[in-house]
Amino acid sequence: VPDKTVRWCAVSEHEATKCQSFRDHMKSVIPSDGPSVACVKKASYLDCIRAIAANEADAVTLDAGLVYDAYLAPNNLKPVVAEFYGSKEDPQTFYYAVAVVKKDSGFQMNQLRGKKSCHTGLGRSAGWNIPIGLLYCDLPEPRKPLEKAVANFFSGSCAPCADGTDFPQLCQLCPGCGCSTLNQYFGYSGAFKCLKDGAGDVAFVKHSTIFENLANKADRDQYELLCLDNTRKPVDEYKDCHLAQVPSHTVVARSMGGKEDLIWELLNQAQEHFGKDKSKEFQLFSSPHGKDLLFKDSAHGFLKVPPRMDAKMYLGYEYVTAIRNLREGTCPEAPTDECKPVKWCALSHHERLKCDEWSVNSVGKIECVSAETTEDCIAKIMNGEADAMSLDGGFVYIAGKCGLVPVLAENYNKSDNCEDTPEAGYFAIAVVKKSASDLTWDNLKGKKSCHTAVGRTAGWNIPMGLLYNKINHCRFDEFFSEGCAPGSKKDSSLCKLCMGSGLNLCEPNNKEGYYGYTGAFRCLVEKGDVAFVKHQTVPQNTGGKNPDPWAKNLNEKDYELLCLDGTRKPVEEYANCHLARAPNHAVVTRKDKEACVHKILRQQQHLFGSNVTDCSGNFCLFRSETKDLLFRDDTVCLAKLHDRNTYEKYLGEEYVKAVGNLRKCSTSSLLEACTFRRP
């Protein structure tokens, strides 16, 4: 019988008492085969973290800073359940740390040196740890003691709870630095008052502070937020302009064998029976013998943290950077304006080899990081392990939802000013063999399908979006008799046609021979009835243009396109017979890397782009013998985006809407995780 006990860790007598009450009340409402609670008492949260790591306990609820400690080796814990605040309809699991300024003050984030600062309190998250952690490498050396470095960075501050004797500048704006509400500039409202009164130039608070202190929109409009990219935004645009997004209070468990499903089952049932306004005799979110025992008193309920989300992703790049800077205190030698090498994310070993060759030829401007799937690459870019990669539009959507931004677009047509003119897009098509003359768009049910990969534009999002509108369900593996759609569940009929061996079968990378445009076309040639690809795929792999044995004798005339009106047309008539226009592939990165990725990639394409004529002896960035490694092989240049610099603007309203509609069919664990952070 599986052990269905969750050992909860308590850090005080009062917590242990509440835990025992929690245990007893759960016993009274849950059947004997359901989850149960046991209580383990430890002296501190750090002791609880160690106990969970050592399998002496299973769960504890932690503030963000401790979630970071819990994640570090050797603890390796992960977030599994989040407390939420506000309403069930609009649950808030995160708050945003922001830098508020007066509208007419005219400076940016990178011009804070010499300004006057207002903090909620020394050592507090939004008011100190996050802003000072992010500014850490700009502080004057020596950076220890930290208070002295901060005092020398700003021209004056109010940092309640600081030592006014040793660091008088930190108390300059609030004599005495009192550590309670007796100090008018203490806490969130106090720090905002410090700015409002004109004592300080910037207040480090949370996003709700300004709304709680200024009910009137006209008053709020006198203030702005400083963004990390050295721009400003209105105070209600905090989701796009903050220092960090911080989880409020989170249950953590072991990463391996951590009982996360059991913990969720327990807490979900607990909130049903003992949540807000549920029971008089025991209340989960109430602490008669103290404050915030086991859970925050202000919590309204629990939400399950998506399984794909590790602590780094949950805490977010900015928060992790800030806390790591404060804890480790390491900065690059003298910070310069020069760009660091761009860490390119390569999928599996074929891309890695091409990336390595690029790295060697770039003489250190490009470094390479490997991942097995596109989603793993996106996650690595999010957390700073990698910086950039080029993505199909479907993944630009996921990357955008995860906070990444497009920087340059692949262009596929030769033109005089290629780099200045991003193209409208390419065509997504459905290709069939000419010999299968009875096959049309209207009778694809039961046929064998070939897709570039799940989540990609021409191979999945567009055809499956159109199909969904027709069949009104997501069971595409039942619609087609079998197929190859790399990235599908291994036991799905949409992996049946794939050719990868062993663990590589149906993997969404080049280890699966039917992956990508060329792979999907090969699948049609060898096994399938229809392939969903781009309009250039057939000409690029016929007429001897692809020397591989399977392709070298193919003739374009032996293939036709399916049109949405039920007719068929020759391959060259794609402009009048396609499924939709698809946005070109684009390079994505984190916002903080945008300028450097743009600069280095433009240098690199001038050295190794389409202007290189002999690829047999020279490195060519946009060539890989039809394998589309790192970039599509038909890329002519990487073009500036001009004002299309967000994923929504880049992909266009129509495509974003189409992918949004298909979201209910999404199997993307990363998309689920990212929409948890930003619904």
Epitope: L353, K354, V360, N361, G617, S624, E625
Partner: nanobody, 117 residues
Framework: EVQLVECGGGLVQPGGSLRLSCAAS????????MAWYRQAPGKQRELVAG???????NYRDSVKGRFTISRDNAKNTMYLQMNSLKPEDTAVYYC???????????WGQGTQVTVSS
């Protein structure tokens, strides 16, 4: 197809030196980017150092200042001079000319380097 043969490996004490060489048959050598890779037991193969046709070099951080890559186009040979060797340099070392262009997963036998006291 270009054949690449690595040699020069062996057992050496920490702090010692070795010089690996990679001999290529075929004329592609002088125009290709060349590189040394290594693979330790249970680990992924990793790029150690590379050299372009014009002689520009690039090294992984952990070997910078200790290893030197060079090539002699007249002899169709590439070298890796390894000084101040450490136990973590223990691996099978392979050379590649990238001429197979990433797709035909061909690697030579490699040469074993063991750093141990």
């Amino acid at each position: 197809e270009v054949q690449l043969v690595e040699c020069g490996g062996g057992l050496v004490q920490p702090g010692g030196s070795l010089r690996l060489s990679c001999a290529a048959s075929g004329s592609i050598f002088s125009i290709a980017t060349m590189a040394w890779y290594r693979q330790a037991p249970g680990k992924q193969r990793e790029l150690v150092a590379g050299i372009t046709r014009s002689g520009s070099t690039n090294y992984r951080d952990s070997v910078k200042g200790r290893f030197t890559i060079s090539r002699d186009n007249a002899k169709n040979t590439m070298y890796l001079q390894m000084n101040s060797l450490k136990p973590e340099d223990t691996a099978v070392y392979y050379c590649t000319d990238y001429s197979s262009r990433y797709y035909h997963d061909y690697w030579g036998q490699g040469t074993q380097v063991t750093v141990s006291s």
